[in-house]
């Protein structure tokens, strides 16, 4: 680890002396000297700070655009940036998520592994042997062939990955 | 009134080792950080690093990591720097200071020689 | 790290006279530019502190300003007992540094 420094934790150093930093949601206003106390003021409406700091000035808060998609999922707070999420229909385009992009749709012949959330696009996969998926969707899964035995019929026509099995009668033996 | 008062002059040799110490009185030892600053003749002066002699911890100019190791004895009031592996570039006058405000009260000066 | 420049290396002036020494700071240090006096035999003794705060016994005539990467010392009604190298060092960031000094002499 590294060695401990000349200021403790929670203090900078400035001018060969230690001064307190501003506690979160606070910003400084003057530094300490050998008779007064490091001088923090609160982060006004729309502003924040998240750590121990000597900043002078606050952060904004980040805005949630609408016209990219975005909306508030929790408000910021003195401490705390407000977090954006997408609307409905919508994800992120980053972490920071600065921006959406409609969740891609699976197209037939894949369905999906993984629905999307605010922050995550749909994963698709390519429906395997058995199952299938005949339309372009953000939700559906591939679906099982149907079973013809159970139903007392045969496969007429084999599926794919993008059609179901098609199902018939059973031959009649001529006598 | 404050007051620090350094060891006197040493002639060292090169490659040796070599400690300055710094007795200070006047004031409440604890309260206050240490720099310590070195002088060559023509090359001005160096800030070298300073102390906490309540905690010990330290910070250093990177020019002086290796070179010099900054400690305290609380109960003398003392603080020491300890100079490695000295060369001929070593050879200067070295202070200590009492910081707050800025470099608010200087030692007298060491003045370390280094010769074979 | 911040570099410190004093570009007037000597100075010659008269008692009685104002004597202005500069200093200039490779970039912005805030308020935090002190002044140090070095006499002759060596003993060296701060004057000004984070600009313009006269530290404790030291006489009036010893005054400081500026901001930014600008400073002065201002000596008026110049003494005898003036006579030394001065240095100013910013105390913004670490590592600290020193403008490489004045000289003060008597013409």
């Known amino acids: 680890p590294e060695p401990p420094t000349a200021c403790r934790e929670k203090q900078y150093l400035i001018n060969s002396q230690c001064c307190s930093l501003c506690q979160p949601g606070q910003k400084l206003v003057s530094d300490c000297t050998e008779f007064t106390e490091t001088e923090c003021l609160p982060c006004g409406e729309s502003e924040f700070l998240d750590t121990w700091n000597r900043e002078t000035h606050c952060h904004q808060h980040k805005y949630c655009d609408p016209n990219l998609g975005l909306r508030v999922q929790q408000k910021g707070t003195s401490e705390t940036d407000t977090i954006c999420t997408c609307e409905e229909g919508w994800h992120c385009t980053s972490e920071a998520c600065e921006s959406c992009v409609l969740h891609r749709s699976c197209s037939p012949g894949f369905g999906v592994k993984q629905i999307a959330t605010g922050v995550s696009d749909t994963i698709c996969e390519p429906c395997p042997v058995g199952f299938f998926s005949n339309v372009s969707s953000a939700f559906e899964k591939c679906h099982p062939w149907t079973s013809c035995e159970t139903k007392d019929l045969v496969v007429q026509q084999a599926g794919t990955n993008k059609t179901d099995v098609v199902c018939g009668p059973q031959d009649r033996l001529r006598a | 009134q404050v007051r620090l008062q350094q060891s006197g002059a040493e002639l060292v040799r090169p490659g040796t080792s070599m400690r300055v110490s710094c007795k200070a009185s006047?004031?409440?030892?604890?309260?206050?950080?240490i720099n310590w600053v070195k002088q060559r003749p023509g090359q001005g002066l160096e800030w070298i690093g300073i102390l906490n002699p309540g905690s010990g911890g330290t910070n250093y100019n990177e020019n002086f990591k290796d070179k010099a190791t900054l400690t305290a004895d609380k109960s003398s009031n003392t603080a020491y720097m300890q100079l490695s592996s000295l060369t001929s570039e070593d050879s200067a006058v070295y202070f200590c200071?009492?910081?707050?405000?800025?470099?608010?009260?200087w030692g007298q000066g060491t003045l370390v020689t280094v010769s074979a | 790290d911040i570099q410190m420049t004093q570009t007037t290396s000597s100075l010659s002036a008269s008692l009685g006279d104002r004597v202005t020494i500069s200093c200039r700071a490779s970039?912005?240090?805030?308020?935090?530019l002190n002044w140090y006096q070095q006499k002759p035999d060596g003993t060296v003794k701060l004057l000004i502190y984070?600009?313009?705060g006269l530290h404790s016994g030291v006489p009036s005539r010893f005054n400081g300003s500026g901001s930014g990467t600008d400073y002065s010392l201002t000596i008026s009604n110049l003494e005898q007992e003036d006579i030394a190298t001065y240095f100013c060092q910013q105390g913004y960031t670490l590592p600290y540094t020193f403008g490489g000094g004045t000289k003060l002499e008597i013409k």
């Open positions: 200071i009492r910081g707050s405000p800025g470099f608010a009260y």
């Open positions: 006047g004031y409440a030892f604890t309260n206050y950080l």
């Open positions: 984070s600009t313009s």
């Open positions: 970039q912005d240090i805030n308020i935090y």
